[in-house]
Interface confidence: medium
């Protein structure tokens, strides 16, 4: 007789979740020599331990601490790239600019990127049918708490000039409710971070507005300034051109710097 299982509003755990996490861990540690000491079995055990047998609406950051400890990694100063609502471009950028890192370029972010997972109270099973939805069910679910935990840590360890890529096509270019707005902004350490530089990515080809003057950007500037961190903003009018120039900085059309505008 199949056991009764809690029905949540969100989609269930990604199929082959354990295999995917382990394969990603192996792949990551192979490609990043500085992480070769990491034992992927221990990483999986710690990941599993954070949510298996636990009520999936009562997960805490504490649950993920063993995993965070195993995945400890540092980014060189000036090399952290945060992003909000523009993940694909941020990742395309760090794939070209190999010395800059998003959270998903780090082990823990890489392991969990685009995956969903949850367990159930008092069983060792993974729930492949449904998982809690952040809005409809609860915010303290395994996936949301994971990203909150690792995002906090990522921001806390950043140093130098930190960059953030923001989506200029959205009504709220800076959204206080995003992970960047609610977690990362508040965990940048003024003792280590001299400045936050926002790159506002334009969507339309003919869009020549100065989105650095957007009210939400001004709000971000205010929050950052109050934390004793300097704020800069650049418009990236042509993201395609921007990536092209990152790939080929010597290209004559890139030398003029016309692909973005500075605002302090």
């Amino acid at each position: 007789v199949p056991r009764w299982r809690q029905q949540w509003s969100g989609s269930g755990t990604t199929s082959r979740f354990p295999e995917t996490v382990l394969a990603r861990c192996v792949k990551y540690t192979e490609v990043h020599p500085e992480m070769r000491h990491v034992d992927c079995q221990s990483v999986w055990d710690a990941f599993k331990g954070a949510f298996i047998s636990k009520y999936p609406c009562n997960i805490t950051e504490e649950d993920y601490q063993p995993l965070v400890k195993l995945g400890t990694q540092t980014v060189p100063c000036n090399k952290t790239l945060l992003w909000s609502r523009i993940k694909d471009l941020a990742h395309q950028f760090t794939q070209v600019q190999r010395d800059m890192f998003t959270l998903e370029d780090m082990l823990l972010g890489y392991l969990a990127d685009d995956l969903t997972w949850c367990g159930e109270f008092n069983t060792f099973e993974i729930n492949y049918q449904s998982c809690p939805d952040w809005r409809k069910d609860c915010s303290n679910n395994p996936v949301s708490v994971f990203w909150k935990t690792v995002s906090r840590r990522f921001a806390e360890t950043a140093c130098g000039v930190v960059h953030v890529m923001l989506n200029g096509s959205r009504s709220k270019i800076f959204d206080k409710n995003s992970t960047f707005g609610s977690v990362e902004v508040h965990n940048l350490q003024p003792e280590k971070v001299q400045a936050l530089e926002a790159w506002v990515i334009h969507g339309g080809r003919e869009d020549s507005r100065d989105l650095c003057q957007d009210p939400t950007i001004k709000e971000l500037e205010s929050i950052i300034s109050k934390r004793n961190i300097r704020f800069f903003c650049k418009n990236i009018y042509r993201p395609d051109k921007f990536l092209q120039c990152v790939k080929n900085p010597e290209d004559s059309s890139c030398l003029s710097g016309i692909h973005h505008h500075h605002h302090h």
């Epitope: 394969a23 792949k27 992927c40």
Partner: antibody
């Protein structure tokens, strides 16, 4: 007790192919990385490549690129190494080996080896 | 690829004595180095990984040290079962590569 059991010795003609199997028992197969290492008579060890069974991801040493194919069948917990265009210098014992835990860099568990003789 | 060079090629030691085997990498491999023991007709056996961590079941007389390009395997007091060929292997860069081996024989 985790074991890797390899297929038996093979005698092959130059120019032909050989496919060696490696069956894992006593552990979760799909999430362990399997490497293949060979050893010519009286010579040292030579790493050929590896596979992650759960994804099929492979990585090969440049020397064997284009001649070696490493695969894995999760349903039978078996990894395979196929070497084509055989020449006499390919005469060697071929080992499959598994990393400690889920990591493939150091090889903690080895198969018994399969002697492949290439001779006309 | 990274070339691993072991020395000496052969080491003659009396039982109970200390044996020191060297392994040099052509470029830094950090601490991503393993040591194996192989006896005639047998598969290699993992002794050390991470340059200095003993594998499960390996006696304390085996110890590894070094990082970067210079590594050492020390057998503090050779037992009769330790006479074998020893290989170092780096797993810092593709492809993983082995040294040519050091044969430890009875003096």
């Amino acid at each position: 007790q985790v074991q890797l059991v390899q297929s038996g010795a093979e005698v092959k003609k130059p120019g032909s192919s050989v496919k060696v199997s490696c069956k894992a028992s006593g552990g979760e197969f799909s999430i362990y990385v399997i490497s293949w290492v060979r050893q010519a008579p009286g010579q040292g060890l030579e790493w050929m490549g590896r596979v992650i069974p759960s994804t099929g991801d492979t990585n090969y040493a440049q020397k064997f690129q284009g001649r070696v194919t490493i695969t894995a069948d999760e349903s039978t917990s078996t990894a395979y190494m196929e070497l084509s265009s055989l020449r006499s210098e390919d005469t060697a014992v071929y080992y499959c080996a598994r990393g400690k835990a889920y990591y493939s860099g150091w090889l903690a568990i080895w198969g018994q080896g399969t002697l492949v003789t290439v001779s006309s | 690829e990274i070339v691993m060079t072991q020395s000496p090629a052969t080491l003659s030691v009396s039982p109970g004595e200390r044996a020191t085997l060297s392994c040099r990498a052509s470029q830094s491999v950090s601490s991503n180095l393993a040591w194996y023991q192989q006896k005639p007709g047998q598969a290699p056996r993992l002794l050390i990984y991470g340059a200095s961590t003993r594998a499960t079941g390996i006696p304390a007389r085996f110890s590894g040290s070094g990082s970067g390009t210079e590594f050492t395997l020390t057998i503090s007091s050779l037992q009769s079962e330790d006479f074998a060929v020893y290989y170092c292997q780096q797993y810092n860069n593709w492809p993983w590569t082995f040294g040519q081996g050091t044969k430890v024989e009875i003096k």
